[in-house]
C-alpha cells in the first residue's frame, strides 16, 4: 500500500510506504501504523531542526532518521548524528550548516528500528523552510517635523528577506501593518506628536532566495514619543 500525503507547507508530495504483513482477522500489525510527520525548519541557514511528535507513538519508541539529497552529489544516505530528545525518546534531529543544501531536494526518512519495514519518506524544499532570526537594532530617525524613518538590521543577507512592520499608538486597539521589501526601510509620513508610538518588525525568507511561509519572531519593540512629548521633545527612541 503506497499512500501519498500532501504536506501543508508548499513542498513536494511526501510518499509514505506502509507495509502490510500477514495478520489475524480484524487486526493490523504494528508495521501498518503511520509514523508521525517530520517537520523541518532551517534557522537563518545556520542549522536545521527536523522534529516529530514522539508522543503520537502507541508506546515510547526511539525512531531513527536518515536523510539524503535527491539527484545530487549529496545523494548518499546519511544517519542523523545529533538527535533531539523529548523525555528521553528521540523527537528530532539537528543538522549543521555544512549538511544543509538549500536548493537540492531534501529527502528525510523516519524509521522504527524495531520494525524496519515501518518507515516514512518525505521530500522537502529547504529554501521554503528557512526562518531568519528576528530583526535587531531598531532605530528611529526624524526626517521632518511629522515624519519618522524606521531602520533595522538582520543577521542575514538583506536581499533575501522581506519584512512586515507593525506600529500603533497608545490610543490604538490594533496594529497597523506595512510590508517592506529587501531595502528594509520604512517611513511614517504623519506622526502625531501627542501620542506615543510602538514599532516592531519581523522578516521572512521570500521571495528572492526562497518561498518561505513562516516569519521570524518579532523584534523587540521600539517606542517614540510620549504623552508629555510637547513638554519634552527629546523623549524618543526609547528601547523596550
Amino acid at each position: 500500500l503506497n499512500t501519498t500525503i500532501l504536506t501543508p507547507n508548499g513542498n513536494e508530495d511526501a510518499t509514505t510506504d506502509f507495509f502490510l504483513t500477514s495478520m489475524p482477522t480484524d487486526s493490523l500489525s504494528v508495521s501498518t501504523l503511520p509514523l508521525p510527520e517530520v517537520q523541518c525548519f532551517v534557522f537563518n541557514v545556520e542549522y536545521m531542526n527536523c522534529t516529530w511528535n514522539s508522543s503520537s507513538e502507541p508506546q515510547p519508541t526511539n525512531l531513527t532518521l536518515h536523510y539524503w539529497y535527491k539527484n545530487s552529489d549529496n545523494d548518499k544516505v546519511q544517519k542523523c548524528s545529533h538527535y533531539l530528545f523529548s523525555e528521553e525518546i528521540t523527537s528530532g534531529c539537528q543538522l549543521q550548516k555544512k549538511e544543509i543544501h538549500l536548493y537540492q531536494t531534501f529527502v528525510v526518512q523516519l524509521q522504527d528500528p524495531r520494525e524496519p519495514r515501518r518507515q516514512a519518506t518525505q521530500m522537502l524544499k529547504l529554501q521554503n523552510l528557512v526562518i531568519p532570526w528576528a530583526p535587531e537594532n531598531l532605530t528611529l530617525r526624524k526626517l521632518s517635523e511629522s515624519q519618522l524613518e524606521l531602520n533595522w538590521n538582520n543577521r542575514f543577507l538583506n536581499h533575501c528577506l522581506e519584512h512586515l512592520v507593525q506600529y500603533r499608538t497608545d490610543w490604538d486597539h490594533s496594529w497597523t501593518e506595512q510590508s517592506v521589501d529587501y531595502r528594509h526601510k520604512f517611513s511614517l509620513p504623519s506622526v502625531d506628536g501627542q501620542k506615543r508610538y510602538t514599532f516592531r518588525v519581523r522578516s521572512r525568507f521570500n521571495p528572492l532566495c526562497g518561498s518561505a511561509q513562516h516569519w521570524s519572531e518579532w523584534s523587540h519593540p521600539i517606542h517614540w514619543g510620549s504623552n508629555s512629548s510637547k513638554e519634552n521633545p527629546f523623549l524618543f527612541a526609547l528601547e523596550a
Epitope: V45, Y103, Q104, H159, C160, P207, L208
Partner: nanobody, 117 residues
Framework: QVQLQESGGGLVQPGGSLRLSCTAS????????MTWARQAPGKGLEWVST????????AYAASVEGRFTISRDNAKSTLYLQLNSLKTEDTAMYYC??????????PGQGTQVTVSS
C-alpha cells in the same frame, strides 16, 4: 563540477551600455537563484544583483538600481546583466555566482568592465 563562464565585458564610455552573460553547467541551474557581484581595483567583492530561480523576483544594490537589469534563461542555463548609463565607478571585474551571493561557492573567472572616456 560547477562551471560558470562570464563574458561580454569591455571598454565603454560613460553613459554607454554593455550586456554581460554567464553560462552555467554542472548543476541544476533552474533550481538556484543566481547573483552578480563585482570587484573594483583595490576593493572587496560587492554584491550587485540577485535573481530568483524562476526569474520572477530580482534585487539590486542601491548603487546600480534603475541602471542595471538582471535576467536569466533557464532553458539555456544562462544568466545576464544589462548595464546601462554606465559610470566610471562601475569599473570592476564582474562575476556571476550560484546562489544568493553569500560568498560560496567561489565565482567564475569574471569579465572586466572598464568605463572611461
Amino acid at each position: 563540477q560547477v562551471q560558470l563562464q562570464e563574458s561580454g565585458g569591455g571598454l565603454v564610455q560613460p553613459g554607454g551600455s554593455l550586456r554581460l552573460s554567464c553560462t552555467a553547467s554542472g548543476f541544476s541551474f533552474s533550481s538556484y537563484p543566481m547573483t552578480w557581484a563585482r570587484q573594483a581595483p583595490g576593493k572587496g567583492l560587492e554584491w550587485v544583483s540577485t535573481i530568483a530561480s524562476d526569474g520572477g523576483s530580482t534585487a539590486y544594490a542601491a548603487s546600480v538600481e534603475g541602471r542595471f537589469t538582471i535576467s536569466r534563461d533557464n532553458a539555456k542555463s544562462t544568466l545576464y546583466l544589462q548595464l546601462n548609463s554606465l559610470k566610471t565607478e562601475d569599473t570592476a571585474m564582474y562575476y556571476c555566482t550560484k546562489g544568493y551571493g553569500d560568498g560560496t561557492p567561489a565565482p567564475g573567472q569574471g569579465t572586466q568592465v572598464t568605463v572611461s572616456s
